[in-house]
């Protein structure tokens, strides 16, 4: 079996995790995609997902998580704004392909959020008012929770991550103020 790897991101409270998950454009462009957290010994928990079918460049916000699927670039952008210490954990992007098992898009992200002064502006509600927010009456129909088991049959593509404010432009090269430590299981 292919070994799963992790990439470690160390950020400060108030900063924004900005992850770009690459996927095969032709195969998965309109497929529904999700951001999950994984805790030791527990089932992956779906925190947010795109619409079904996934819309191009249409941001969806669930709490402090913003998902945006760029079909023309073949990437899912995940932002977690105004990071809190309790956000620390292991995350992954997955792509739903029912009835088959969901496909993990990239190496898992080990997020470590620490207290302390953030060099980037703290995110607030006003900075994300332009995105589509799922209403409080969200039902299962808006986010069918297809599972993502812990096995991977092929090496997932790499991801990139930025520290940014929520309204920053897509930038695949500007990675600043971040420590990345690959961890092999």
């Amino acid at each position: 079996a292919t070994k799963l790897t992790e990439e470690k991101y160390e950020l400060k409270e108030g900063q924004t995790l900005d992850v770009k998950c690459d996927y095969t454009l032709e195969k998965f462009a309109s497929s529904q995609k999700a951001w999950q957290i994984i805790r030791d010994g527990e089932m992956p928990k779906t925190l947010a997902c795109t619409e079904r079918p996934s819309k191009n460049s249409h941001p969806v916000q669930v709490g402090r998580i913003i998902l945006e699927d760029y079909h023309d670039h073949g990437l899912l952008r995940v932002r977690m704004v105004n990071l809190q210490v309790e956000d620390s954990g292991l995350y992954q992007c997955v792509i739903y392909q029912p009835p088959k098992e969901p496909h993990m898009l990239f190496d898992r992200i080990r997020l470590v959020v620490t207290k302390g002064f953030s060099g980037t502006p703290g995110s607030n509600e006003n900075s994300t008012q332009n995105v589509y927010k799922i209403p409080p009456t969200t039902t299962k129909a808006l986010c069918p929770l297809y599972t993502s088991p812990r096995t991977v049959t092929q090496a997932p593509p790499k991801s990139t991550a930025d520290v940014s404010t929520p309204d920053s432009e897509i930038n695949l090269t500007n990675v600043t103020d971040i420590i990345r430590v690959p961890v092999f299981n």
Partner: antibody, heavy 120, light 112 residues
Framework: QLQLQESGPGLVKPSETLSLTCTVS??????????WGWIRQPPGKGLEWIGS???????YYNPSLKSRVTISVDTSKNQFSLKLSSVTAADTAVYYC????????????WGRGTLVTVSS | DIVMTQSPDSLAVSLGERATINCKSS????????????LAWYQQKPGQPPKLLIY???TRESGVPDRFSGSGSGTDFTLTISSLQAEDVAVYYC????????FGGGTKVEIK
């Protein structure tokens, strides 16, 4: 309409292994939307989650029972099973199988339950 | 493990009156990242399996009458039956899945 049905011996001797099977009808156990779980309820008491499984075989167990529990799945028979080893009288309970929404660990569909008594 | 504590243990309410059941968790079941409380409520009638009523603390399961409502956040939650009907006599359980999966001890609702 999907239904779950537990089956297995109603009486198990102390120190032996409790074995139960849950048969899924009216739908496929291989649905990528769900986990399949076991929950038990001692007579007159509350509910305790035992563990859950995905059709691919990924399993998750209650830490307090993990050393004694094995959950397996047989997609060809549309069934999943529970084995609980080294049972004592404290394991006497109604055992339920249930369908579990993935990503949110609540149980949205339950079997009727089967009473298992541990006694010599 | 997160411990779920329900109160009261039992409750007698007149038909048509409001019934309120409380559930307290030993740790927060709120994920602040997506602002979801991972808490569910179940109804169990005698001789029957539990039935899902509410998930995400306040979202009613399909087909559940609107007299059932859930509220609360973090560690303190409430299930309210706005106008008790005879068929609501049951034991009600809360359940969290923020960290592991644990249930409350149950609250028995009877008619006064």
């Amino acid at each position: 309409q999907l239904q779950l049905q537990e089956s297995g011996p109603g009486l198990v001797k102390p120190s032996e292994t409790l074995s139960l099977t849950c048969t899924v009808s009216g739908g496929s156990i291989s649905s990528s939307s769900y986990y399949w779980g076991w929950i038990r309820q001692p007579p007159g008491k509350g509910l305790e989650w035992i563990g859950s499984i995905y059709y691919s075989g990924s399993t998750y167990y209650n830490p307090s029972l993990k050393s004694r529990v094995t959950i397996s799945v047989d997609t060809s028979k549309n069934q999943f099973s529970l084995k609980l080893s080294s049972v004592t009288a404290a394991d006497t309970a109604v055992y339920y199988c249930a369908r579990q929404e993935y990503g949110d660990g609540y149980f949205d569909l339950w079997g009727r339950g089967t009473l298992v008594t541990v006694s010599s | 493990d997160i411990v779920m504590t329900q109160s009261p243990d039992s409750l007698a309410v007149s038909l048509g009156e409001r019934a309120t059941i409380n559930c307290k968790s030993s740790q927060s079941v709120l994920f602040s990242s997506n602002n979801k409380n991972y808490l569910a409520w179940y109804q169990q009638k005698p001789g029957q399996p539990p039935k899902l009523l509410i998930y995400w603390a306040s979202t009613r399961e399909s087909g559940v009458p609107d007299r059932f409502s859930g509220s609360g956040s973090g560690t303190d939650f409430t299930l309210t039956i706005s106008s008790l009907q005879a068929e609501d006599v049951a034991v009600y359980y809360c359940q969290q899945d923020a960290t592991g999966i644990t249930f409350g001890g149950g609250t028995k609702v009877e008619i006064k």
